[in-house]
Structure formats: C-alpha cells, structure tokens
C-alpha cells in the first residue's frame, strides 16, 4: 500500500513539476527590465527563452520573437536547449510511469517488469529536473554576471555614439516556476525510485545443493570411471557419486548432472 | 553594426517649417524610445523631444506646441515636424535610439546619429 501510495505521489509530483517546466520555457518573463532613461513613460522590458516585449505605463505592449538562431548568443542557446532536454526527457518519463503504476493493470506484467520501469521514469525525471535547474541556473547566473546594472559607458560608433543605457535587470517570473517545478521534478524522481525499491520482488532463495568428492584428489578417468584415491577400499571399482546402481559392467552409461563436479 | 542618418536640415527664415528625418538601420532587434536632442553653436545639449515605440510624445517646454515628433516603427524611422521656427532653434539636432541588436536582445544601448545643422536666420 505504501509503495503504491509512493509511486502514486511521486508520479503526480513529476506531472506538475513537468507542468511547470513546459510554462517557465514557455513565458516570456526570464529577464525584467526597468528602462530609467526614458522621460516620457514608464517602459518596462521583459524578455522570454523565445522572444522580447516591450510594455508601456499607457498600456502599449508589443512582443519580438528571436526568429534568429545563429546569432543569438550562446547561453540562451544552451539554457534553450536544457530545458527542451528537460521536457522531452520528462515526458518520456510520464509516459513510462504511467504504465509502470502498480494501480494500473496491463495484460499480465510483472511486478519486476514494473519495477523496472518505475526506476527508469524515475531516473528520467531526476535528470529532467536537473536539466531544468540548469537552465534556470545558468540563465540567472548569466543576469547577475553580465547584466545586473549596465552602467553609462559612452563610446564612439560608427553614425555617432553609443552608450549603453542604464537598466536594472531583474529576476523574472518565469525563474522561479523553472526552479520549483525542476524541484518537483527532482522530488518526484527520487521518490519512483525509492516505490521501485518496494515494487522490485523478494529474492527467491534457492537450496544451493553442494556436491563433495569422498576423497582428497579425485581424478577422473575415460569411461565416466573414477580412481580411489588409496583411501578407502572401493574395490569393485563403482563409480562414485552414483549410490552405487551400476557397476564396471556398465561401461556405456550416460554422464549424469553428478558426474562433473 | 546600427546606424542613425539624420536628413531634412537646411537655412530656413523665422516662422518657416522644417522636417526633420532619421533612419536607423543595422542589425536592430527592437527599438524602444526615439528623440531628438540639439546643441545650439557655443551651448550644451537640450533636450528637445522623445517618442516611444506605443506612440506616447513628450517635449521640452520651448518648443511645445511648434514641434510635432512622429515614428514609423516599420520603417526604423523618426520625424520631427518643425513649426513656427524661430532664431533660438539654430543648432545642430541629434537623433537617438534606445535599441537591442539582433545578437544581443537582452541588452539596450542608446545609438546616436551624427546630426543635421537647422539655421533659422533672414
């Protein structure tokens, strides 16, 4: 009961988890951005995995995709790629938990052919909720190093100058849902793993049937003959092991499972 | 790499009208606020009149209800729509952007054009 409870929790815990994976990759709330430079109206920025949005205090939003891919910089490609890393694998672990729920019958599995899969899907959401916390990790990482107060540096470009303008960047929304629902995810994970432990069947303990020879140094001879070893008489020259049912004269008897030892 | 191109400036007498034009072109993303700043012969730099990408205007007392500052979003392009010119606005007008490239969009710099001389004189 409590293993089926386990699984059941962690399968659940992994679907919202997973849930929240696909928004946090979907929103366009990564990166928040205050533009102070502007004397007309407050603009605030945001920027997504996909695209970027300007949105106005009058009530003006307008949205950009990154159509894009190989001039986008590198770490929104890798946290890009994390994250659809994390969904893929957190769906093909949905899809394997689903029929490895010991609630669920499918023709005439086996509890260890279920508690095979319950490890799997468990492991699968274990890594897609890593992959999620990277992501989101990297992704926060890469505000708080690079872009946390652009300061006014003024240089001469081509057309005139350029300066960078003075924004706060901030942590979006869209952060914190990656970092919950990888933490789900994770939760999720190590708990199919722990209801595969109580799924997987009790060993069978099998009586081990150990034979001995009767003397020090058995030597085996052609024939399915064995010699005495001086010890001991067998001077009808029986073969050992044999409870003594067939004699010399039984030259062509077949080799039994006792015969090799 | 952005540029701002400033066109539309010339000798025009007091009272006279005047159309200012910028063209920003390059790798932009997306342009946020676009204004124009002049600096009269001698003097600093004034502000004069901002647009944002929604449309919503803002002026420098001195030259409100004379100027009219508009923006093509499609185009990359600003205007400026000067009325009832008087001497004081002789100077050179400077266009600028707020602006993210297409290989950084999570980054905004402010791209300003060479300038274009407007003298007002009889």
């Known amino acids: 009961m409590a293993v089926t409870a386990c699984q059941g929790l962690g399968f659940v815990v992994s679907l919202i988890g997973i849930a929240g994976i696909i928004a946090a990759t979907c929103m366009d709330q990564w990166s928040t951005q205050d533009l102070y430079n502007n004397p007309v109206t407050a603009v605030f920025n945001y920027q997504g995995l996909w695209r970027s949005c300007v949105r106005e205090s009058s009530g003006f939003t307008e949205c950009r995709g990154y159509f894009t891919l190989l001039g986008l910089p590198a770490m929104l490609q890798a946290v890009r790629a994390l994250m659809i890393v994390g969904i893929v694998l957190g769906a093909i672990g949905l899809l394997v938990s689903i029929f490895a729920l010991k609630c669920i019958r499918i023709g005439s599995m086996e509890d260890s052919a279920k508690a095979n899969m319950t490890l799997t899907s468990g492991i699968m959401f274990i890594v897609s909720g890593l992959c999620a916390i990277a992501g989101v990790s990297v992704f926060a990482n890469m505000l708080v190093t690079n872009f946390w107060m652009s300061t006014a540096n003024m240089y001469t470009g081509m057309g005139g100058m350029v300066q960078t303008v003075q924004t706060r960047y901030t942590f979006g929304a869209a952060l914190f849902v990656g970092w919950v629902a990888g933490g789900l995810t994770l939760i999720g994970g190590v708990m199919m793993c722990i209801a595969c432990r109580g799924l997987a069947p009790e060993e069978t303990n099998y009586k081990a049937v150990s034979y001995h020879a009767s003397g020090h140094s058995v030597a085996y001879k052609p024939g399915g003959f064995k010699a005495s070893t001086g010890f001991g008489s067998n001077t009808k020259n029986k073969k050992i092991y044999d409870g003594g049912a067939r004699t010399e004269d039984e030259v062509q008897s077949y080799p039994s499972k006792h015969d090799y030892v | 790499q952005v540029q701002l191109v400033e066109s539309g400036g010339g000798l025009v007498q007091p009272g006279g009208s005047l159309r200012l034009s910028c063209a920003a072109s390059?790798?932009?993303?997306?342009?946020?606020?676009m204004g124009w700043v002049r600096q009269a012969p001698g003097k600093g730099l004034e502000w004069v009149a901002v647009?944002?990408?929604?449309?919503?205007?803002n002026y420098a007392d001195s030259v409100k209800g004379r100027f009219t500052i508009s923006r093509d979003n499609s185009k990359n392009t600003l205007y400026l729509q000067m009325n009832s010119l008087r001497a004081e606005d002789t100077a050179v007008y400077y266009c600028?952007?707020?602006?993210?490239?297409?290989?950084?969009?999570?980054?905004?710099?402010?791209?300003w054009g060479q300038g274009t001389l407007v003298t007002v004189s009889s």
């Open positions: 390059g790798s932009i993303f997306l342009i946020n606020a």
């Open positions: 647009i944002t990408r929604g449309g919503s205007a």
């Open positions: 600028n952007a707020d602006l993210n490239l297409r290989s950084d969009p999570f980054k905004w710099y402010t791209f």
